[in-house]
């Protein structure tokens, strides 16, 4: 987190705000809806409480406005700049406002104006970006989905280092974000993408370009808001230009950053048995054409040039790839060998001596 | 509906540059990922770059570091950025919106020579 210079703060624990205007994209109550819970997102964590008035000026002054809107702080139509809001202080300080030129929604569809109304607020609160991809005070904006919105810890700590913690979190869950080189790291999934590799751990993943230490982490929703914040397993088909990820009984196939027409499609359509509830690995071989999907102490083996299950299959885990244990979180390929991933401990496996070479730390696929 | 109409590509000798664009008519354009593919004489067609909705953008191996995508949803228009340009570029470049199953323009020849 990172707060103003100077430590811009509120010297009072009970503010006030005022909805100036309204966008013509929602109804009035949505908006008092949204904002009303953009304020609560803080005040369950500290010890501010936030009431609203009807006219007279209030500490943050909420409006809606376009292009040049009084503040020398102009607009830009839409998307680019959403809104802003000041820190902390008389006047404008933690006024905020927000471009009228946006489609404000309280759905995933345009801006959702709550999500973004919460950041805005840490901001007239005393907080500034965050270079923590997984916090709500990260500059790029990110549908994060229509489950109950939990604020990440990284915020928690910024506004507590400001005003200190409230009486009794009533959501005392607060998501952390992935640290790569922790030594009990394990993975979710692995796949190739266009010569990256993308390795995803709860709602994130890190992009690991080739010749590369330094992987960048993003939120998996920021790549493609349409899918699940988590996934199970994941694979690439080179030629095809696709990659396939796989969430419970469902899986998608994306093209880049964009879902196939007919996605999702339920994982029994592969040929999987209706008892599979979830893949939780997947590697393609694409010389052989052939996809190992893992389940539990299982393995299929999936035709993906004929679409069918290959017969024999499913198998024991254990005796296909002896010594890697009866799970797999997480796979790839490279070189002729496969990286099996269970908990923090990664399995080199040579394909040609089919046996073990190497065990490494899960998180040495990140250099650490 | 999106139509997309890409600038006219050109000839260049290798280590030079050249900038495509690729403008979009339909308001719809800011919705979609906008992706560059090109397709060299007896090969398939492959892709080359992309950038999201959100401006996170992606690079096929050969072309990283040396090509850069951008967008300008205002305006509706996509941009190629293309420098250190090698005799392997040589192909008729196509721009995308929304991916495999999307819309394509017609496609813009460039050449590269030693």
């Known amino acids: 987190y990172n707060v103003f210079p100077r430590t811009l703060k509120w010297s009072k624990m009970n503010l006030t705000y005022r909805i100036v205007n309204y966008t013509p994209d929602m109804t009035h109550s949505e908006v008092e809806k949204a904002f009303k819970k953009a304020f609560k997102v803080w005040s369950d964590v500290t010890p501010l409480n936030f009431t609203r008035l009807h006219d007279g000026i209030a500490d943050i002054m909420i409006s809606f406005g376009i292009k040049e809107h009084g503040d020398f702080y102009p607009f830009d139509g839409p998307s680019g700049l959403l809104a802003h809001a000041f820190p902390p202080g008389p006047n404008y300080g933690g006024d905020a406002h927000f471009d009228d030129d946006e489609t404000w929604t309280s759905s995933s569809k345009g801006y959702n104006l709550f999500l973004v109304a919460a950041h805005e607020f840490g901001h007239s609160l005393g907080l500034d970006h965050s270079k923590d991809p997984g916090a709500l005070m990260f500059p790029i904006y990110t549908y994060t989905g229509k489950s109950h919105f939990m604020l990440p810890d990284d915020d928690v700590q910024g506004i507590q280092s400001l005003y200190g913690p409230g009486d009794e979190d009533p959501n005392p869950k607060h998501p952390k974000t992935p640290d790569k080189c922790d030594p009990s790291l394990s993975l979710d999934a692995i796949t190739s993408l266009r010569g990256e590799t993308m390795i995803f751990k709860d709602r994130f993943f890190w992009r690991l370009h080739p010749q590369q230490v330094d992987a960048e982490l993003f939120l998996t929703k920021s790549f493609w808001p349409e899918l699940p914040n988590r996934i199970d397993a994941a694979y690439e088909h080179p030629s095809h230009d696709l990659i396939f990820i796989f969430r419970g009984r469902k899986f998608w196939a994306l093209n880049g950053y964009d879902i196939l027409e007919g996605y999702p499609k339920k994982i029994s359509e592969l040929g999987l048995p209706k008892e599979v509830k979830k893949i939780s690995a997947a590697v393609h071989f694409e010389d052989t054409g052939k996809t190992l999907l893992f389940s539990g102490n299982q393995v299929w083996r999936y035709d993906d040039t004929n679409h069918i299950m290959d017969k024999d299959y499913p198998r024991l885990i254990e005796e296909d790839f002896p010594g890697i244990g009866d799970k797999v979180d997480a796979v790839y390929e490279k070189n002729g060998y496969i990286y099996f991933f269970n908990g923090p401990i990664q399995f080199e496996y040579s394909i040609w001596s089919n046996r073990i070479v190497r065990v490494m730390p899960a998180n040495s696929i990140l250099w650490c | 509906e999106v139509q997309l109409v890409e600038s006219e590509g050109g000839s260049v000798q290798a280590g030079g540059s050249l900038r495509l664009s690729c403008a979009a008519s339909?308001?719809?354009?800011?919705?979609?990922?906008m992706n560059w593919y090109r397709q060299a004489p007896g090969k398939q067609r492959e892709f080359v770059a992309g950038?999201?909705?959100?401006?996170?953008?992606n690079y096929a191996v050969s072309v990283r570091g040396r090509f850069t995508i951008s967008r300008d949803n205002a305006e509706g228009t996509g941009y190629l950025q293309m420098n250190s340009l090698k005799p392997e570029d040589t192909a008729v470049y196509y721009c995308?919106?929304?991916?495999?199953?999307?819309?394509w323009g017609l496609g813009t020849q460039v050449t590269v020579s030693s």
């Open positions: 995308n919106a929304g991916g495999l199953q999307g819309y």
């Open positions: 339909g308001s719809t354009f800011s919705r979609y990922s």
């Open positions: 950038i999201s909705v959100g401006r996170i953008t």
